[in-house]
Every structure is written in structure tokens, then in C-alpha cells.
């Protein structure tokens, strides 16, 4: 069984995540807290990184410019990152593009993807 200190660390990590992902603020039973936090946090950070990269790659977000940038966004960085990025883009490319075109912030886009929103029930 994990020590109380371990859960304290997990909660501290969760509070850090909340700063960029406020919907992580809900807290559930100790047993599934850390796993879910790590899982949500990882997907959410991947999303933020990709969206921020895409924003830097285009002067003005349009369907055309973001679509073009999306084909190159995973090409930079380590091969493991490229795999994670490509997997994310396969699932969410169209929606990320729509969010960017509409002028949503990276945080809004990643939250709208429900990457950090447990829609019902505890974490």
C-alpha cells in the first residue's frame, strides 16, 4: 500500500496541473488519484505542446495555414515525441485546427478535447 506522503506528492502534482488545467481540480478516492492524474496530465501536456507549436508555425490561423502546419508539427524533436505527436494528431487534428482557426487559446482547445475533464464522477 502506498504511503500518505506519496499521495501528498500526487496532490501537489495535481495542484500544479490545475494551474494550466483547472478541470483537474476534482479529486477522487486515493487509489486511482495518481494514475488518472498522470494520464490526464500527459495527454493534456502533449496537447498544449502541439497547439503551442502550431501557433508558432502560422502567422494567422486559417484552415489552410493550420492544415499545412499540421503536416510538419510532429517532424521536430525526438522520435519518441514524433510518435506521441503523430498519434495525437491522428485523433485530434481536425478539432485542434478548428479551435486554432476560431482563435481559441491552447488551454481552451485542450480542455474542449476533454483531455482534462472527468465529465462525471470522481477522478
Amino acid at each position: 500500500r502506498l504511503s500518505p506522503e506519496y499521495y501528498d506528492l500526487a496532490r501537489a502534482h495535481l495542484r500544479d496541473e490545475e494551474k494550466s488545467c483547472p478541470c483537474l481540480a476534482q479529486e477522487g478516492p486515493q487509489g486511482d488519484l495518481l494514475t488518472k492524474t498522470q494520464e490526464l496530465g500527459r495527454d493534456y501536456r502533449t496537447c498544449l505542446t502541439i497547439v503551442q507549436k502550431l501557433k508558432k508555425m502560422v502567422d494567422k490561423p486559417t484552415q489552410r495555414s493550420v492544415s499545412n502546419a499540421a503536416t510538419r508539427v510532429c517532424a521536430t524533436g525526438a522520435s519518441r515525441w514524433a510518435d506521441v505527436c503523430a498519434n495525437f494528431m491522428r485523433r485530434y487534428q481536425s478539432r485542434v485546427t478548428q479551435g486554432l482557426v476560431a482563435g481559441e487559446t491552447a488551454q481552451q482547445i485542450c480542455e474542449d478535447l476533454r483531455l482534462c475533464i472527468p465529465s462525471t464522477g470522481p477522478l
Partner: antibody
Framework: QVKLQQSGAEQARPGASVKMSCKAS????????MHWVKQRPGQGLEWIGF????????DYNQKFKARTTLTADKSSTTAYIQLSSLTSEDSAVYYC????????????????WGQGTTVTVSS | DIELTQSPASLAVSLGQRATISCRAS??????????MHWYQQKPGQPPKLLIY???NLESGIPARFSGSGSGTDFTLNIHPVEEEDAATYYC?????????FGGGTKLELK
């Protein structure tokens, strides 16, 4: 039901400014961007730009950027367009129209339009 | 800017016949296998009304006699059979590039 109610006709002198409003009801204001379109008498349609009420992001057609300001007030679910340094070329009907941020919110196009506000510029 | 050229500028069609309106874009308006081209109908003194979105999707409440097709740079709006209430001006519009642009319009009259 969805309604975009625009303010009444405006009469203005050359060089003056006008501010028109578009009151949205019947849907979640922050899930749609608000676009503005100009139509001169007997002419076609010209896209002016849009505002995202959620993030405050604006995108303008370069042709209108210098003298146009788009704003939105989330609390009153109202979008505004201000035209400054008016000339006779600004005499037209101005429409507001909503456009979903994400395609799963509705048809990915300008699906509802206001009735239009007529602006007449003359000395 | 992406220029949209509509043809014809006007057409007269008999009741029950087919009306075909073309819209050609100066460059492709496709991405992710989708075409970002839309069609609107406008009657005098009224705002435009969405008929077709993303090239071929019929807007809710629009009669099935309206249909859209095409991809890339060439798009078509078909109305069949034409009814009296279809007399109006029709516009295509793209949301692929910035700024969004409209075609010059096609005025449909009944013979």
C-alpha cells in the same frame, strides 16, 4: 430558438463613427464565433471579420481592419461592430452571423444571421 | 485572397426544371478531405440563408431539392425541381483561406 437581433438603422455624417450591436439568444454564445458581413445596395456580400467571444480573439479582413473594431460582451451575449472615419462607401447593410467554433456544435458555416443594420452616410 | 467566380450571373428556369449554379475557386479550398465551401440563398430585403455547408451537407430544414457537390476548386449547387419560392440570389462562400470570400452571386428567376 436561435435569434440574432441587430440594432436599428443608423444615419451618420462623413468622418463620424457608428457602433452597431447584435444581441444573441437561444444558444451558448461562447461556442460560436460572431462574423460580420457587409452588403452595399444591389451588391454582393463582403466578409469583414469575426470575434471569438470566448477568447476575445479577432480576425479582420485586411480591407476593413484600419477602421473597424469588433467587440463582444459575454455577460449580455452581445457582439458589436464599430466603424470609424465613415465615408459614403460605408453606406450598406451590415449583418452579423454566427459560426460554430467546432463542427460538432452545428453546421460548420454561418448558419444563423441577424436581420441586418442599414447604415447611411451622407452630409 | 481566394477568388470565387460564380456562373452564370443570372439564369431563368421554368418551374419543375433543374437549375445548376457553378462556383470556381482560384485555389483549392480542401483540407482533411473536406471542402470548406458553402452555399447561401438571399431574397430581397432578407439576410442570407445557409443552404449547403462544406460542399455537400444539406442544412437542417432545407428542402432536399437543393444539393451541393464538388471538391478542390470546382463546386456546383443544383436545385431540382425548381419551385416558385426559389427565385433568389445564390452565393458561394469559402472559409479555407483568409479573408473568407463570397462569389459574386447568381440571380435565379423563373420563366
Amino acid at each position: 430558438q436561435v435569434k440574432l437581433q441587430q440594432s436599428g438603422a443608423e444615419q451618420a455624417r462623413p468622418g463620424a463613427s457608428v457602433k452597431m450591436s447584435c444581441k444573441a439568444s437561444g444558444y451558448t454564445f461562447t461556442k460560436y464565433t460572431m462574423h460580420w458581413v457587409k452588403q452595399r445596395p444591389g451588391q454582393g456580400l463582403e466578409w469583414i471579420g469575426f470575434i471569438n467571444p470566448n477568447s476575445g480573439y479577432t480576425d479582420y479582413n485586411q480591407k476593413f481592419k484600419a477602421r473597424t473594431t469588433l467587440t463582444a460582451d459575454k455577460s449580455s451575449t452581445t457582439a458589436y461592430i464599430q466603424l470609424s472615419s465613415l465615408t459614403s462607401e460605408d453606406s450598406a447593410v451590415y449583418y452579423c452571423a454566427r459560426y460554430p467554433i467546432y463542427s460538432d456544435y452545428g453546421p460548420y458555416a454561418m448558419d444563423y444571421w441577424g436581420q441586418g443594420t442599414t447604415v447611411t452616410v451622407s452630409s | 485572397d481566394i477568388e470565387l467566380t460564380q456562373s452564370p450571373a443570372s439564369l431563368a428556369v421554368s418551374l419543375g426544371q433543374r437549375a445548376t449554379i457553378s462556383c470556381r475557386a482560384s485555389e483549392s479550398v480542401d483540407s482533411y478531405g473536406d471542402s470548406f465551401m458553402h452555399w447561401y440563398q438571399q431574397k430581397p430585403g432578407q439576410p442570407p440563408k445557409l443552404l449547403i455547408y462544406r460542399a455537400s451537407n444539406l442544412e437542417s430544414g432545407i428542402p432536399a431539392r437543393f444539393s451541393g457537390s464538388g471538391s478542390g476548386t470546382d463546386f456546383t449547387l443544383n436545385i431540382h425541381p425548381v419551385e416558385e419560392e426559389d427565385a433568389a440570389t445564390y452565393y458561394c462562400q469559402q472559409s479555407h483561406g483568409d479573408p473568407y470570400t463570397f462569389g459574386g452571386g447568381t440571380k435565379l428567376e423563373l420563366k
